[in-house]
């Protein structure tokens, strides 16, 4: 355990005034795993003045950080960069004169308690005023700052000229692009203090490069991948006070591909499972032994899960017999192209034949049995992928 602190498997606490700690507590090698620490409590540590960039990074599981009644004066910008689990920060009654929102912008904090710090009235802490104004009343804190006359002023009354939230505006073309093509987005930002502009492209797969010049920025996306369809691209303007963003959704059109087609499985119904990708939504057509398969209430396509441009479903068959054994071909088609895949399905052996011992019994002897059955009908119901009640369950995308 760090000197002058006590530890459990998930907690570190350093609360004794003397001799106290002069640096943020670090676990010794071969002691408790820092990743398991969820809470650090520091109190009465007047000689603890700084949290350095790498002091907290080992505590990746940290949820609660409390440093109260201590001497904290400075927190490095990247101090909490690796602590994405942090939810509660309490820096009550320390010596902080300034604190940037850059410390916390990547965190999903439930609490940030900062009362009793000698903040200097400046644009640097205007973000705290903005934060307070967006909080519901029970959560508000009595925050003060020292003005030029060294008088305590409520943060709620703070007025700093040329110190406001920035703005971002995207000038985007219609972001519906064909796979393999390129597109350029333009963004302009404004505000005082002058904001920085950056692009948030999330997990964009396609190659992209940006150029930024003062208040203007462009993002060029080349050889666009179908994997990026539905992804959001944001232009972000950020300054001391806060940030603004403007976003667009990327839609990529591409030819269908059948990524999965398997032999039938039996559950409540028989199912020939498939997965099809394509945008716009492909039309599906089944073929049985090379001829169009006309769907009916006994044999029909069901889509169970829709994941943006990917469709998981089944050709569902009610009580198929040996009459339905054969080759099934799925064709998926949209305006950009088509794809087809085939599987052989065997549902059951013929009557009077021990199929276990005669698996290759010549089907030609039974041609007279291939007249239409109640499983099919003569109407061609080929159409776009039908939506079903199964696809309407919660947690499904459409």
């Amino acid at each position: 355990c760090p000197t002058s602190c006590k530890c459990s498997s998930a907690r570190i606490w350093c609360t004794e005034p003397s001799p106290g700690i002069v640096a943020f507590p670090r676990l010794e090698p071969n002691s408790v795993d820092p990743e398991n620490i969820t809470e650090i409590l520091i109190a009465n540590q007047k000689r603890l003045e700084i949290i350095n960039e790498d002091d907290v990074e080992a505590y990746v599981g940290l949820r609660n950080l409390t440093i109260v009644d201590s001497g904290l004066k400075f927190v490095a910008y990247k101090a909490f960069l690796k602590n994405s689990n942090l939810r509660h920060i309490n820096f009550t009654r320390n010596k902080l004169t300034s604190l940037s929102r850059r410390h916390f912008r990547h965190l999903d904090l439930s609490d940030l308690i900062l009362t009793g710090n000698p903040f200097t009235c400046s644009c640097d802490i205007m973000w705290l005023k903005t934060l307070q104004e967006t909080k519901s009343s029970p959560d508000t804190q009595d925050l003060y700052c020292l003005n030029e006359s060294s008088k305590n002023m409520p943060l709620a009354n703070l007025q700093i000229p040329n110190c406001g939230l920035p703005s971002a505006r995207l000038a985007a073309p219609n972001l519906t692009v064909e796979e393999g093509k390129s597109v350029t987005l333009s963004c302009s930002v404004g505000g005082d203090p002058l904001p920085t502009l950056y692009w948030d492209v999330g997990n964009l797969v396609s190659k992209h490069m940006n150029e930024t010049s003062h208040t203007q920025g462009s993002l060029r996306i080349t050889n666009i991948s179908s994997d990026d369809s539905g992804k959001q691209i944001s232009c972000v303007a950020e300054n001391l006070v806060g940030e603004d963003q403007d976003s667009v959704n990327l839609t990529v059109h591409f030819a269908p591909t059948i990524t999965f087609l398997e032999s039938p499985t039996s559950d409540h119904h028989w199912c020939i499972p498939f997965t099809v990708r394509g945008n716009p939504k492909p039309a599906l057509q089944w073929f049985y032994n090379g001829a169009i398969l006309n769907e009916s209430k006994y044999i029909c396509t069901k889509i169970h899960v829709t994941n943006h441009t990917e469709y998981h479903g089944c050709l569902q068959l009610d009580n198929p017999t040996h009459m339905n054994n054969g080759d099934y071909t799925l064709m998926a088609k949209n305006e950009y192209g088509k794809d087809e895949r085939q599987i052989s399905a065997h549902f059951m052996g013929r009557p009077g034949v021990d199929y276990e011992t005669n698996p290759n019994y010549p089907e030609v002897l039974y041609e007279d049995w291939t007249t239409p059955t109640d499983i099919g009908d003569t109407t061609n119901k080929s159409n776009e992928i039908p939506s079903t009640d199964v696809a309407d369950q919660s947690n499904r995308e459409h």
């Epitope: 002058s4 006590k6 004794e16 005034p17 003397s18 109190a43 009465n44 007047k46 000689r47 009644d69």
Partner: antibody
């Protein structure tokens, strides 16, 4: 070396005020907590409270809250314990304690006698 | 405020081991210091942070703390160790002393 030098013994009447002192030397006075401890005749030790001279942050034990005031003057490296109205039950030896390694340095004690 | 309980007195023969206990609720979660006080003298810190010895304190003084009990052990007790011993811990940033144990070396 680190030393804490306390003011001389005091004899007072009930209702009078009093301020005793403790002067630190040989270490960075402002950077370490200083505590005051009471020992009544024939009894054990009791924490009165502690002060951090650099910012005058003061903590009192519950039984002494509102009864005494602890203060510090960093310019002369001195901390004080004062009463606005003494009682006979305040008769005791009062020690100050500080140091870089816990409270490892103690003053010699100031005997306060309150008697009518 | 928490209460620290010590035995009022303990007698030990020279060169024997003396163990003075100090008990309190979840005391192991706090740091315990031990002070020695001889008649007419100021207290002297002999153990701090459960187990640490300040410079100048003989090795025969040692400390431990877990659960609800802290212990000061004096191995090979000498006549000069006869004194009152006080345990001390911090509770909500104020100090708390035990009632003290009078150690008599027979």
């Amino acid at each position: 070396q680190v030393q804490l030098l306390q003011s001389a013994a005091e004899v007072k009447k009930p209702g009078e005020s009093l301020k005793i002192s403790c002067k630190g030397s040989g270490y960075r006075f402002t950077s370490y907590w200083i505590g005051w401890v009471r020992q009544m005749p024939g009894k054990g030790l009791e924490w009165v409270g502690i002060i951090y001279p650099d910012d005058s942050d003061t903590r009192y034990s519950p039984s002494f809250q509102g009864q005494v005031t602890i203060s510090a003057d960093t310019s002369i490296s001195t901390t004080y314990l004062q009463w606005s109205s003494l009682k006979a039950s305040d008769t005791a030896i009062y020690y100050c304690a500080s140091g870089e390694v816990a409270f490892d340095v103690w003053g010699q004690g100031t005997t306060v006698t309150v008697s009518s | 405020q928490s209460v620290l309980t010590q035995p009022p007195s303990l007698s030990v023969s020279p060169r024997q081991t003396a163990s003075i206990t100090c008990s309190g609720d979840k005391l192991g979660d706090k740091f315990v210091s031990w002070y020695q006080q001889k008649p007419g003298q100021s207290p002297v810190l002999v153990i701090y942070q459960d187990t640490k010895r300040p410079s100048g304190i003989p090795e025969r003084f040692s400390g431990s703390n877990s659960g609800n009990t802290a212990t000061l052990t004096i191995s090979g007790t000498q006549a000069m160790d006869e004194a009152d011993y006080y345990c001390q811990a911090w509770d909500s940033s104020t100090g708390v002393f035990g009632g003290g144990t009078k150690l008599t070396v027979l």
